[in-house]
Amino acid sequence: AGTPEVWVQVQMEATELSSFTVHCGFLGPGSISLVTVSWGGPDGAGGTKLAVLHPELGTRQWAPARQARWETQSSISLALEDSGASSPFANTTFCCKFASFPEGSWESCGSLPPSSDPGLSAPPTPVPILRADLAGILGLSGVLLFGCGYLLHLLRRQKHRPTPRLQPSHTNSQALTAQAWAPSQASQAALHDPYATINTSFCPATLDTAHPNGWASLPTHAAHQPQGPAASASTPILARGSFVSVENGLYTQAGERPPHTGPGLTLFPDCRGPRALEGRFGVR
C-alpha cells in the first residue's frame, strides 16, 4: 500500500474576486475520521481553525468560512468570504489536516500564488511546513542517519519512477483557478518532484482513536473508504512518517483516558488522529 498523502488546492472565484475556495483531499486507504482546515499555518502551530469536518457528526465552521462541505468521502471544500478590499486571502496559507485510521494524522498546506493572472492556472506551489519538533526527538544523529538512508532510497527509486499523477482538478469554467496543490506524501521525493511536499505533520496511529478536542474512541463500526489513486502507487519507504514531525501533545497527554473507556470517548492528546468517533455533524 502507498503512503497516504494530502493535497490542498486554493481557488479564487472568477465571478467574485473576494471569494475563495479551499479544496483538500486525502489519498490513501484509511478511513477518514476528521478534517481540520486552518489558515495562517498548521493547526496547533500558529494556525487558526476555519472549520472542522467529521464524516458523520457534521461540520463546524467559523468566519470567514462561508460553507464547509464534504465533496466526496475523502475530500472536502471550504468556501471563504473575503470582506476586506485588500483581499488578505491572497497571501494566506491554508492547511488541511486529515485524521485517518490506521494511518494517523496528515497535514498539508497551500496558498494562492501571488501572481495569478485571471484565467491562467498557476503552477502548483506547495508550502512545505515540516516542523522542527522531530529533530528534538530524534537528535542530530538520528536526522543524519535518516538523511543518508533517505538519499539511498531516492537513488534506488529513481530507477523505478512511477508514472506521475495528474493533479486533481476541482476547477470549472467559472473559476479562475489560481491553484496551490500541495500533495503530502512521506515517500515522495521533492528532489524528483518539485511540486511535492514532504508530509508536513504526522501523528502515528494508535489503538485509541481521537476526537477533535482530544477525546478519543475505539472504532465501533468500520467505515471503509475507497482507495485513492495514490494508495496503489506503492513506492518503497523507509518507515512511515519517519521524516515527518509528531505533533506536540503526543507525549503530554497520551496516558489520559477520560469519559468512557471501551468503544466510547476517551481522551487523546492534541494530535487528533487516527479515528475520531465515527460520526456526527454535516455541513454547517
Epitope: 467529521h54 464524516p55 477525546w215
Partner: antibody, heavy 114, light 113 residues
C-alpha cells in the same frame, strides 16, 4: 474524565443580564467549540450559539443575536454565556455542551421574574 | 432554518414491546458528497441534560444499548427501541446536524403502558 461544570441557579429581574459559566476539565479546552443550548420549562431544546475557545470565534443563532454574548477564558478553561435584556420567556435551563453535543454540563436554571 | 417535526408527541408502550419514534426534516439531511445523513437522536430524563444516543442517523453512541437503533435517509428518520425497558422512559429528541443552526424536534415523550 471530561466534565463540564456550570455555575449555579440565578434569579433575575426583567431587563437585566445574566452570565452563566461553564468550566471544562479533562480535555483540551481550546480544541473544540463550546455550545450553549437552552430549554424552557416543559419545552424543547434551542441552540443559542457556540465559541471556539482557541480563537474566540463565535457563531450565534439569529434569534439571539444582539442579546447573547459567548466568551471564553483559556487560562481557566471556562466558557461564558451572557444574555441581556432578560424577559420572562427567557426563564429556562441553560446548558453548555461540547463535541457536537456529546458532552453536557448539568444545566443552570435562570429564572426571570419581577 | 431546518424545521424538525417529531411524531407522535407522546407514546405509551408496554415493557418488552417495540417503540417507534419518527422525525421529519423540512430539508434533506443527506450530504450528497459523502452520502451521509446528518441526524442525531437524544434521550432526556427528568432533571438531566440530554444524552446522545444516535448520530449519523444510524450510528449508536458508545455505551448505548443495542435495543436502540436509528434508520432513515433524506428527510424521514426513525428511532426504534426494540424491547422497551423501564429505564427508557424519557423524552426523545431528533436533531438536524446538517446545517446551522442546529435545530431540534419538539420531543416525544415515551411512557410505559
Amino acid at each position: 474524565e471530561v466534565q463540564l461544570v456550570q455555575s449555579g441557579a440565578e434569579v433575575k429581574k426583567p431587563g437585566s443580564s445574566v452570565k452563566v459559566s461553564c468550566k471544562a476539565s479533562g480535555g483540551t479546552f481550546s480544541s473544540f467549540s463550546i455550545e450553549w443550548v437552552r430549554q424552557a420549562p416543559g419545552q424543547g431544546l434551542e441552540w443559542m450559539g457556540e465559541i471556539l475557545p482557541g480563537s474566540n470565534s463565535t457563531n450565534y443563532n439569529e434569534k439571539f443575536k444582539g442579546r447573547v454574548t459567548i466568551t471564553a477564558d483559556e487560562s481557566t478553561s471556562t466558557a461564558y454565556m451572557e444574555l441581556s435584556s432578560l424577559r420572562s420567556e427567557d426563564t429556562a435551563v441553560y446548558y453548555c455542551s461540547s463535541y457536537w453535543f456529546a458532552y453536557w454540563g448539568q444545566g443552570t436554571l435562570v429564572t426571570v421574574s419581577s | 432554518d431546518i424545521v424538525m417535526t417529531q411524531s407522535p408527541d407522546s407514546l405509551a408502550v408496554s415493557l418488552g414491546e417495540r417503540a417507534t419514534i419518527n422525525c421529519k426534516s423540512s430539508q434533506s439531511l443527506l450530504n450528497s458528497g459523502n452520502q451521509k445523513n446528518y441526524l442525531a437522536w437524544y434521550q432526556q430524563k427528568p432533571g438531566q441534560p440530554p444524552k446522545l444516543l444516535i448520530y449519523g442517523a444510524s450510528t449508536r453512541e458508545s455505551g448505548v444499548p443495542d435495543r436502540f437503533s436509528g434508520s432513515g435517509s433524506g428527510t424521514d428518520f426513525t428511532l426504534t427501541i426494540s424491547s422497551l425497558q423501564a429505564e427508557d422512559v424519557a423524552v426523545y429528541y431528533c436533531q438536524n446536524a446538517h446545517s446551522y443552526p442546529p435545530t431540534f424536534g419538539q420531543g416525544t415523550k415515551l411512557e410505559i403502558k
